[in-house]
């Protein structure tokens, strides 16, 4: 006899990285017929929602109107059908960004390289942080962590055309409080030098929509929501 229901999906819209004082919605998708959803924050009950009518709703939303460092952290949700509770969802790491300062990102040996060359990103921030994060924009989640007093090195090693794309970095004051994003750095990796028609890259976004792109799981984009790549989430832990 089944003791628990399947775990729900949890994600953040528009993004798990939320600029301070901006709004974010935490979504929890369980099953039709669920009479109650609970959102837990850092292990404690944070909010409850009882959908009406339950048989026509399989998703609830918890709205945070004003993001701040106190709201940043790990969220999970569960739901109940009758007396039976679900397994808890995966953890969602909600990060507040645009805290304090802006790092600078540079790429060595330059923004245009040949496939096979060793590439290193440098992220620098002259304020009190020792953890840095490098993110590549696009469909797949690419989050790297680096450490250093005022700067971190992110060696990509010998690159391929798969490394092409737009990168940004953040200084991290703790796991869930990040700086403003750096200015973007676009890396162009040429494979066959004589033929510069290259494979299409992950979609990239203009600077002003940086906060809206989605990092997704191996399962790809879902119709009505994005699932967070567990690997990327683990990097935050």
């Amino acid at each position: 006899q089944q003791q628990t229901l399947p775990k729900p999906f949890i994600w953040a819209e528009p993004h798990f990285m939320v600029p301070k004082e901006k709004q974010v919605t935490i979504c929890c998708q369980g099953n039709y017929g669920a009479v109650e959803y609970q959102l837990h924050f850092e292990g404690s009950l944070f909010a409850v929602d009882r959908p009406k009518p339950p048989e026509r709703i399989n998703k609830v939303q918890f709205y945070i109107p004003d993001m701040n460092s106190r709201m940043a952290g790990q969220y999970s949700c569960i739901y109940r059908v009758g007396e039976l509770w679900s397994e808890p969802s995966n953890l969602l790491d909600l990060v507040v960004t645009e805290m304090y300062d802006t790092p600078t990102l540079s790429v060595h040996p330059g923004p245009e390289v040949i496939s096979g060359e060793k590439v290193t990103f440098y992220c620098r921030l002259d304020t009190a942080t020792s953890m840095f994060l490098l993110l590549k924009e696009g469909r797949s989640s690419h989050v790297q962590r680096g450490y250093g007093k005022v700067q971190a090195e992110f060696p990509l090693g010998p690159v391929t055309t798969a490394h092409r794309g737009t990168y940004r970095c953040f200084g991290s004051y703790n796991n869930h409080a990040w700086s403003f994003p750096s200015e973007p750095v676009k890396l162009l990796v040429t494979g066959d030098i004589e033929n510069t028609s290259l494979a299409p890259e992950d979609p990239t976004f203009p600077a002003d929509t940086w906060g809206t792109y989605l990092l997704t799981t191996e399962t790809g984009l879902q119709k009505d929501h994005a699932l967070w790549d567990h690997t990327a989430q683990n990097l935050l832990r």
């Epitope: 600078t104 060595h108 040996p109 330059g110 040949i114 440098y122 620098r124």
Partner: antibody, heavy 117, light 107 residues
Framework: QVQLQQPGAELVKPGASVKLSCKAS?????SYWMHWVKLRPGQGFEW???????????NYNEKFKRKATLTVDKSSSTAYMQLSSLTSEDSAVYYC??????????WGQGTSVTVSA | DIVMTQSQKFMSTSVGDRVSVTCKAS??????VAWYQQKPGQSPKALIY???FRYSGVPDRFTGSGSGTDFTLTISNVQSEDLAEYFC?????????FGSGTKLEIK
Amino acid sequence: QVQLQQPGAELVKPGASVKLSCKASGYTFTSYWMHWVKLRPGQGFEWIGEIIPSNGVTNYNEKFKRKATLTVDKSSSTAYMQLSSLTSEDSAVYYCTIRLRYALDYWGQGTSVTVSA
Amino acid sequence: DIVMTQSQKFMSTSVGDRVSVTCKASQNVGTNVAWYQQKPGQSPKALIYSTSFRYSGVPDRFTGSGSGTDFTLTISNVQSEDLAEYFCQQYNSYPFTFGSGTKLEIK
């Protein structure tokens, strides 16, 4: 077009310091590493180091770590190299050069440094 | 440090000839080698990058070849304006190092 402007010559006394300049134009100054190279007659080129203007990160040839200091002024798109405790061994032509695409593809005209009492 | 050896300091050739300038690295540098031309009183000019790729505007009589430790710059159908010194450079590892140069003289 890309230009790296360097003064033609500097005459300095032994033991003194000199600050060489390289004014860049025609490209995004902050995005590309500025390299400095030394050329002594009959001795070939020696790579001194590089600096990225966006955040001032530097990489030096160990041999020049105590001799050369690389800096930039983003507001004027100018790179500098200060050479200290000069001796006759430092008499050379010093070039600034950038890697825009794949190798050191743009060079300044070079500054000839003469160390003489 | 990686030593880039250009064993021939001078090479003499005639207009229309073919000449090969060689460069040997003291350890494997893959294909991360560039060639430069320096004419008297001028700054160096990049000719070849990544061992064999010509910069745009460089005449196709200049070709580069090699990998690992042995590299060659070949100038076919030498012209009088090719009178210059030619340098190799490795950018595979720090510190970047240059060959000592080969002076091409036109007979």
